[in-house]
C-alpha cells in the first residue's frame, strides 16, 4: 500500500510569494513559495495519486508582517483553504501566549493540531481540552494512518507557552502513545513534530513503532541528487535511521519558509512495515504557477497590512542613529535600541535562581540599515522599522563558548576603521578595545551580564563556560565573516521576526530614549 | 494479526485443473497484493505472480502465463489460484504470500498423479 | 529476468559460529530484497525486509545488509533453531525471483 506524504514546516508566515532567499518577493518572475503556488502543486498531486497525506511540522507563525497583523487567523484560514491533513505544534505557535493560539488557530482550524508531550494543568487543562490533541487516526483511502505529534520541550525558552503547559521529554511522551495506536490495530505510525532534526534521528531511533519521522526547527534540507537552489543538503531525502529494534525509518523534512514541498512516497507491507521509501522536496518556483482563488484571497487578505505598516507603533523623542558612519564605527543609540528589544523579547523567568535564561545580545552593526529621525513627530511606524531592518531576518538563541565570543569580538575589529559592517553592537556586554594593539588581539576587556543572579551585574567573561546570546540568523550562519560563531555554536533555536522584536518592544515602552552608554569603548 | 487459511491438499490427474482459495484476515484487505509461490518436492521457491485485490490486476511470471489464473472474491477477501493442462512437474506445494512475501498461507500440496 | 545467484548451496556450523550467506543478482535492485528461512515442512519466513530491516519477533542476530548486486545474511552467533534453509528474494522488478536457497547444517 503506497502513501504519499507532502509535508511543510518552519514557513513562518510566508503566506505570499518570497525571493529565492525567502525575503520580499521582489521580481515576480524570479519568485517562489507561497500558498497560491503551494497549493497548485498539492492539488496536482492530490489528483495524480490516491493515498495523500498533507503534513505541516509546526512554526507555521512568526516570520512577515502577515502575523504581526492578523496573529494567526491567517494560517488556521490559509490551512484549512489547501486542506491540511494535521498539524505539529511549533515553539512559536506560544509566541502570543496560550490565547494567541487557542483563539486564532486551535479553535478556527479544520485539521488536527498534535503534539503528545505538552501537558496541560491547572485552569487551563479544561479551557484548552481537545483543543490539540497526542495523535490522530487519519482514514486514507482503505487504510488508516496513525499521526503522533511533538513539541520542542525547550519552547519555554524560546517563547511564551505561560505556567500552565508542561513539556515532557519527546521519546518518554511518544512511547505511551504510539503503543496505544498499536493496541487500536493502527500499524502505520507517522512522527510529525518540531524539536529539529537530532531529535528527528533520535525518535526514529527510539520510539518503538515508529515508521517514518517528518520534522521541522532546524530548517533541515535533504536532498537526493542535484539540488535545485541554493540551499546546501545536511543529507539524502529521506534520512535513513536504522532504529534500536533493526528497521530502517525514513526521516524528513523540507527546509522552511514555504520554499519547498516535501514528497515522500511509502510503500507499507500488512503488517505495517516500510518496505520503501523515496521522493525528494519539490522546489516551488515560477515554473509552478499560482492558485488564481488563492491567489485572490491572499490579495483580499493583503488590504490590511499595507494600512498597518503606516500606523504609529510608538514614539521616539531621541534621534534614533542607525547611521553607518555611527553604527560600524562605535556604540550607536539604534543598535543599543534593537539589542534591548532582543533581551526584552527573550525575558523567560523559568527558574528562580535566574533572573533570566539569557542577557546577552551581539548584532552586526551592517544589519542596521538607516536611522529615525526624531522630527517627525517622534512617530515611529512599521515602516521606519524596515528601512532598518530591511532584510527580514531573525533574532535567534544561541549558546556559546566564552572562548567563541572572544573570537567574536576580535573578529569584531580586526579591521576597524573601513566601515566593514561586522563591527558588533551590544546589550548585556561591556567591551574595551585597544585599536592600537594587533588585529586578533584588540579586546582587552570583555564583562558580561549574569543570569544566575538577582541583583543583574557585570562580570569577567570566561572562556570554558556556555553562555546564551541573542543575535541576527544572519551571525548565527556565520554573516559578515563570523565563521567561529557558525562553527562552534551549540546549540541554535530561530527566533523572532527581528522588525517584530522591535515593533513590540517600542509598542510596550510607548515612548523610547534610548543613550549611548559606555557599552562599547 | 495476519492470516492466511488456504485450501486442502489436492490430487488431479494429468490434463485438468486445480484451483487453490488462500483466505486472509487480519488486515485491510483491498489495500494489499498477494503473490503465489511454487515450491516443487526438494526444490527451491519459485514466484507464480501476483494478484492486486482491489481490482483484479495480476502480473504472471512468464513460466506460468498461460495456464495460470489468480483471481480475488472481495466479499470474503478470498484468492484463487487456477492452474491448468496439470502436467507431473507441477506436483509441487503452493503458498499464498501477502505483498512482501511478510506472511504465508500453511501451503497447499498438490499431486499430478495418473 | 533478474537472476538470484546464492552462495553456498549448503554449509555446516556449530552452535555459536557466524555465519554468512551471500546472493548476487544479475544486475542492481536497488535494496528490494528479503530473506527468509524455511524449515522441512514448514511454510517459509520472512527474516529481514528491505535488505536490512528485520521483521518484528526475528533475533537481532539476524542482520542483512548490501547494495547494488551484493547482498549479505548474517547470523552472529548460530543457535539451534537456526538451522534450516535460507533463501533471498528479489523484489525490484517483475518477476520476483528467488536465490537456490542455502541448507545451513549442524557439523
Known amino acids: 500500500w503506497e502513501l504519499t506524504i507532502l509535508h511543510t514546516n518552519d514557513v513562518h508566515s510566508r503566506l505570499e510569494q518570497t525571493s529565492e532567499d525567502s525575503s520580499k518577493c521582489v521580481n515576480a518572475s524570479r519568485c517562489m513559495g507561497g500558498v497560491a503556488r503551494l497549493f497548485t502543486k498539492v492539488q496536482q498531486i492530490r489528483r495524480a495519486e490516491p493515498n495523500v497525506l498533507l503534513l505541516d511540522a509546526g512554526d507555521q507563525y512568526q516570520g512577515t508582517i502577515w502575523f504581526t497583523v492578523y496573529k494567526g487567523a491567517e494560517v488556521a484560514h490559509f490551512m484549512n483553504a489547501l486542506r491540511y491533513d494535521a498539524m505539529a505544534l511549533g515553539n512559536h505557535e506560544f509566541d502570543n501566549g496560550v490565547e494567541g493560539l487557542i483563539e486564532p488557530l486551535l479553535k478556527e482550524a479544520k485539521f488536527p493540531i498534535l503534539s503528545a508531550n505538552i501537558k496541560a494543568k491547572g485552569p487551563l487543562a479544561s479551557q484548552i481540552s481537545g483543543l490539540y490533541l497526542p495523535y490522530k487516526v487519519l482514514p486514507v483511502g482503505d487504510e488508516v494512518v496513525g499521526i503522533v505529534g511533538y513539541t520542542s520541550k525547550e519552547t519555554p525558552f524560546l517563547s511564551n507557552p505561560g505556567t500552565n503547559l508542561v513539556f515532557e521529554d519527546e521519546i518518554t511522551a511518544l512511547q505511551p502513545e504510539v503503543d496505544k495506536l498499536k493496541t487500536l490495530n493502527v500499524n502505520k505510525i507517522i512522527a510529525l513534530g518540531h524539536s529539529g532534526f537530532e531529535m528527528d534521528k533520535l525518535i526514529a531511533q527510539k520510539v518503538r513503532g515508529v515508521d517514518v519521522v517528518v520534522g521541522g526547527h532546524s530548517n533541515t534540507f535533504l536532498y537526493t541528487g542535484n539540488p535545485p537552489s541554493k540551499e546546501v543538503p545536511a543529507g539524502k531525502y529521506p534520512f535513513i535511521v536504522t532504529s534500536d529494534d533493526g528497521r530502517k525509518v525514513p526521516v524528513v523534512q523540507a527546509y522552511a519558509f514555504g520554499k519547498y514541498l516535501g514528497y515522500l512516497k511509502i510503500e507499507f507491507d500488512e503488517r505495517g512495515n516500510v518496505i520503501s521509501s523515496h521522493g525528494n522536496p519539490i522546489l516551488l518556483n515560477s515554473s509552478i504557477p499560482e492558485d488564481p482563488s488563492i491567489k485572490a484571497d491572499i490579495n483580499k487578505w493583503r488590504i490590511k497590512l499595507d494600512n498597518y505598516s503606516t500606523q504609529e507603533l510608538g514614539k521616539t523623542i531621541v534621534y534614533l542613529d542607525g547611521s553607518s558612519q555611527s553604527c560600524r564605527f562605535r556604540e550607536c543609540n539604534m543598535g543599543n535600541l534593537i539589542c534591548d528589544a532582543m533581551i526584552n523579547n527573550n525575558l523567560r523567568h523559568t527558574d528562580e535562581m535566574f533572573w533570566n535564561h539569557v542577557s546577552m545580545c551581539i548584532l552586526n552593526g551592517g544589519g542596521i540599515r538607516s536611522p529615525i529621525d526624531e522630527r517627525n513627530n517622534g512617530t515611529i511606524t512599521w515602516e521606519n522599522l524596515a528601512a532598518v531592518l530591511p532584510f527580514g531576518g531573525t533574532f535567534d538563541l544561541v549558546q556559546l563558548k566564552g572562548s567563541t565570543l572572544k573570537k567574536a569580538f576580535e573578529h569584531s575589529v580586526h579591521r576597524y576603521g573601513q566601515s566593514t559592517g561586522e563591527f558588533l553592537q551590544v546589550g548585556g556586554i561591556h567591551v574595551v578595545y585597544d585599536l592600537s594593539r594587533k588585529p586578533g588581539d584588540r579586546v582587552v576587556k570583555l564583562d558580561v551580564l549574569c543570569t544566575k543572579c538577582r541583583v543583574p551585574s557585570y562580570d569577567p567573561l570566561k572562556m570554558d563556560e556556555v553562555y546564551k546570546v541573542i543575535l541576527p540568523n544572519f551571525l548565527a550562519n556565520g554573516g559578515d565573516g563570523f565563521q567561529m560563531i557558525k562553527d562552534e555554536l551549540l546549540r541554535h533555536d530561530s527566533g523572532d521576526q527581528d522588525i517584530n522584536v522591535v515593533s513590540t518592544y517600542i509598542s510596550k515602552m510607548k515612548v523610547i530614549y534610548p543613550a549611548v552608554e559606555g557599552r562599547i569603548k | 494479526e495476519v492470516q492466511l487459511v488456504q485450501s486442502g491438499a489436492e490430487v488431479k490427474k494429468p490434463g485438468a485443473s486445480v484451483k487453490v482459495s488462500c483466505k486472509a484476515s487480519?488486515?485491510?484487505?483491498?489495500?494489499?497484493?498477494m503473490n503465489w509461490v511454487m515450491q516443487a518436492p526438494g526444490q527451491g521457491l519459485e514466484w507464480m505472480g501476483r494478484?492486486?485485490?482491489?481490482?483484479?490486476?495480476?502480473f504472471y511470471s512468464q513460466k506460468f502465463k498461460g495456464r495460470v489464473t489468480m483471481t480475488v472474491d472481495k466479499s470474503t477477501s478470498t484468492v484463487y489460484m487456477e492452474l491448468s493442462s496439470l502436467r507431473s512437474e507441477d506436483t509441487a506445494v503452493y503458498y499464498c504470500?501477502?505483498?512482501?512475501?511478510?506472511?504465508w498461507g500453511q501451503g497447499t500440496t498438490v499431486t499430478v498423479s495418473s | 529476468d533478474i537472476q538470484m545467484t546464492q552462495s553456498p548451496s549448503s554449509l555446516s556450523a556449530s552452535v555459536g559460529d557466524r555465519v554468512t550467506i551471500t546472493c548476487r543478482a544479475s544486475?542492481?535492485?536497488?535494496?528490494?530484497l528479503n530473506w527468509l528461512q524455511q524449515k522441512p515442512g514448514k511454510a517459509p519466513k520472512r527474516l529481514i525486509y528491505?535488505?536490512?530491516s528485520l521483521d518484528s519477533g526475528v533475533p537481532s542476530r539476524f542482520s542483512g545488509s548490501g547494495s547494488g548486486t551484493e547482498y549479505t545474511l548474517t547470523i552472529s552467533s548460530l543457535q539451534p533453531e537456526d538451522f534450516a534453509t535460507y533463501y533471498c528474494?528479489?523484489?525490484?522488478?517483475?518477476?520476483?525471483?528467488f536465490g537456490g536457497g542455502t541448507k545451513v547444517e549442524i557439523k
Open positions: 504470500a501477502t505483498s512482501y512475501v511478510g506472511d
Open positions: 494478484i492486486y485485490h482491489n481490482n483484479g490486476d495480476t
Open positions: 528474494l528479489q523484489y525490484a522488478s517483475f518477476p520476483w525471483t
Open positions: 487480519g488486515y485491510t484487505f483491498t489495500a494489499y497484493f
Open positions: 528491505a535488505t536490512s
Open positions: 544486475q542492481d535492485i536497488g535494496d528490494s
